[in-house]
Interface confidence: low
């Protein structure tokens, strides 16, 4: 008869991450007694995959029930495949000896490569603000994929831009790849609206890419632009300076009232109007009692937008000589009025 | 949420026979080696027996010959035929899930009980 | 099969204690020792596999050492919640076999 010989008829295999592998092998004789076992690598490190004589191997199916007598075929199962499994794997005949068996002859082996997807695109946005024409990084992160080859582009509102840097590593070769790519987008003041989308195209992805996106809300701030006037009034001695804050964003504004550089009052933005770009509108007034004032008024709305430095804008304040003549013995404050809002200027 | 669920425990007299049933959910069964674990009242953790993914049996020595553990993959549930009871097989019987790499017992049912008396 | 001795059976200690169970082997079981703890009227819950590795959702001041025969469960700060029964176990071949239980208790 024949000596024995262990047959691997592929060369390679290739398997989506999650799917079972089969793997294999047929023997061409029941001679030499012994069993037969799987490896993953070859040499002194080789792990042990199956053994047909005892232990307990839970992913591990026989193709074939090997406890009859007249079965030579030998393949494996190996399920819920990750990239940690590929390898070359061996078809190994022992030969039963003691104190152990033997190794009598090895398959030529079969190479199991992993095709994982790559994980959803994880878009991160710089951490801090920036305003308008100022330039912001945007990075997108994607792990676990194989084979190495990956594709990604990067869009703003749809728009694909070219000013990125990707990275794939390692740069050798690995069970899994992961991939970073830095994008510089430059701001705009419609930019509250707007989106910077990550899109990653693999092999495993059957031409439906990932897409990762941010919010340029989470990375723009456009300062308010202001302006204060001065509204007409019926009475004679009173006046009514508006403050308009106009096409800020994020929210958060303060808004301080001097007169004469002291401070009159402070009040927090709360019923805001929204432009259709995405920014707000508010506005503040403050009604003068102009008896309380011998002297021309300087009025100045300042303003304090998302921690930033504030900016002001003053008006000043005609006290006419009739209201001077009759106003000198008055000295009570002036009356404030509540903020009321204005129209959006879209 | 992975769960196992366990039922079919009840009252039989000695040389009877009874079913457990363990209902899973959360995951495929069959991809996972599955176990019948027992615990006498007051008493210690006793394996019985176990199914693999590829169908393969084992038992402990004192129920061989009189229990059999099968699965229905399309009811994703377990089963432990007992026949032959005595007494010494009351415990309550929990149904365990092995873990996929090693097979260590991850997820636990919150067991059935099995009252042999006459 | 392989026989598995804890030890001790019972233990009294107190809250922000550090304890040490035992579990020793009949014979070599590689790494293939688990750990579970059950609580009165209670399934066991699964704390450790492969004699050192913590289940999901099991908190830190559990750990596991040992290969071969000889295996340790320290609870590193006992916490009310900890006071239980703890059971070892083998399961590198058939019929799993479990030790016969560590009642901790509150001292």
């Known amino acids: 008869e024949d000596e024995l010989q262990v047959i691997q008829p592929e060369k390679s295999v290739s398997v989506a991450a999650g799917e079972s592998a089969t793997l294999r092998c047929a023997m061409t004789s029941l001679i030499p007694v012994g069993p037969i076992m799987w490896f993953r690598g070859a040499g002194a490190g080789r792990e042990l995959i199956y053994n047909q004589k005892e232990g307990h191997f839970p992913r591990v199916t026989t193709v074939s029930e090997l406890t009859k007598r007249n079965n030579l075929d030998f393949s494996i199962s190996i399920s819920n495949i990750t990239p940690a499994d590929a390898g070359t794997y061996y078809c190994v005949k022992f030969r039963k000896g003691s104190p152990d068996d033997v190794e009598f002859k090895s398959g030529a082996g079969t190479e199991l490569s992993v095709r994982a997807k790559p994980s959803a695109p994880v878009v991160s946005g710089p951490a801090v603000r920036a305003t308008p024409e100022h330039t912001v990084s945007f990075t997108c992160e994607s792990h676990g994929f194989s084979p190495r080859d990956i594709t990604l582009k990067w869009f703003k509102n749809g728009n694909e831009l070219s000013d990125f840097q990707t990275n794939v590593d390692p740069a050798g070769d690995s069970v899994s790849y992961s991939i970073h790519s830095t994008a510089r987008v430059v701001l705009t003041r419609g930019d509250v609206h707007s989106q910077v989308i990550c899109e990653i195209a693999h092999i495993t992805l059957q031409g439906d890419p990932l897409r990762g996106t941010a919010n340029l809300s989470e990375a723009i701030r456009v300062p308010p632009t202001l302006e204060v006037t001065q509204q007409p009034m019926r009475a004679e001695n009173q006046a009514n300076v508006t403050c308009q804050v106009s096409n800020f964003y994020p929210r958060g504004l303060q808004l301080t009232w001097l007169e004469n550089g002291n401070v009159s009052r402070t009040e927090t933005a709360s019923t805001l109007i929204e432009n259709k770009d995405g920014t707000y509108n508010w506005m503040s007034w403050l009604l003068v009692n102009t008896c309380a004032h011998r002297d021309d008024v300087v009025l100045t709305c300042q303003v304090e937008h998302d921690g930033q430095q504030a900016v002001s804008k003053s008006y000043a304040l005609e006290i006419s000589a009739h209201q001077k003549e009759h106003g000198s013995d008055i000295t009570h404050e002036a009356a404030l009025a509540p903020t009321a809002p204005l129209g959006g200027s879209g | 949420e992975v769960q196992l669920v366990e039922s079919g425990g009840g009252l039989v007299q000695p040389g009877g026979s009874l079913r457990l049933s363990c209902a899973a959910s959360?995951?495929?069964?069959?991809?996972?080696?599955m176990h019948w674990v027992r615990q006498a009242t007051g008493k210690g953790l006793e394996w019985v027996s176990a199914?693999?993914?590829?169908?393969?049996?084992y038992y402990t020595g004192s129920v061989k010959g009189r229990f059999t553990i099968s699965r229905e993959n399309a009811k994703n549930s377990l089963y432990l035929q007992m026949n032959s009871l005595r007494a010494a097989d009351t415990a309550v019987y929990y149904c365990?899930?092995?873990?996929?790499?090693?097979?260590?017992?991850?997820?636990w049912g919150q067991g059935t009980m099995v009252t042999v008396s006459s | 099969d392989i026989q598995m001795t804890q030890s001790p059976s019972s233990l009294s200690a107190s809250v922000g204690d550090r304890v040490t169970i035992t579990c020793r082997a009949s014979?070599?079981?590689?790494?293939?020792l688990a750990w579970f703890q059950q609580k009165p009227g209670k399934a066991p819950k699964s704390l450790i596999y492969?004699?050192?590795s913590l289940h999901s959702g099991v908190p830190s001041k559990f750990s596991g050492s040992g290969s071969g025969t000889d295996f340790t469960l320290t609870i590193s700060s006992l916490q009310p919640e900890d006071f239980a029964t703890y059971y070892c176990?083998?399961?590198?071949?058939?019929?799993?076999?479990f030790g016969q239980g560590t009642k901790l208790e509150i001292k």
């Open positions: 492969t004699a050192s």
């Open positions: 176990q083998q399961y590198v071949s058939y019929p799993y076999t």
């Open positions: 959360g995951f495929t069964l069959s991809s996972y080696d």
């Open positions: 199914i693999g993914t590829a169908g393969d049996t």
């Open positions: 365990v899930r092995g873990g996929v790499w090693d097979d260590a017992f991850d997820i």
């Open positions: 014979q070599d079981i590689n790494n293939y």
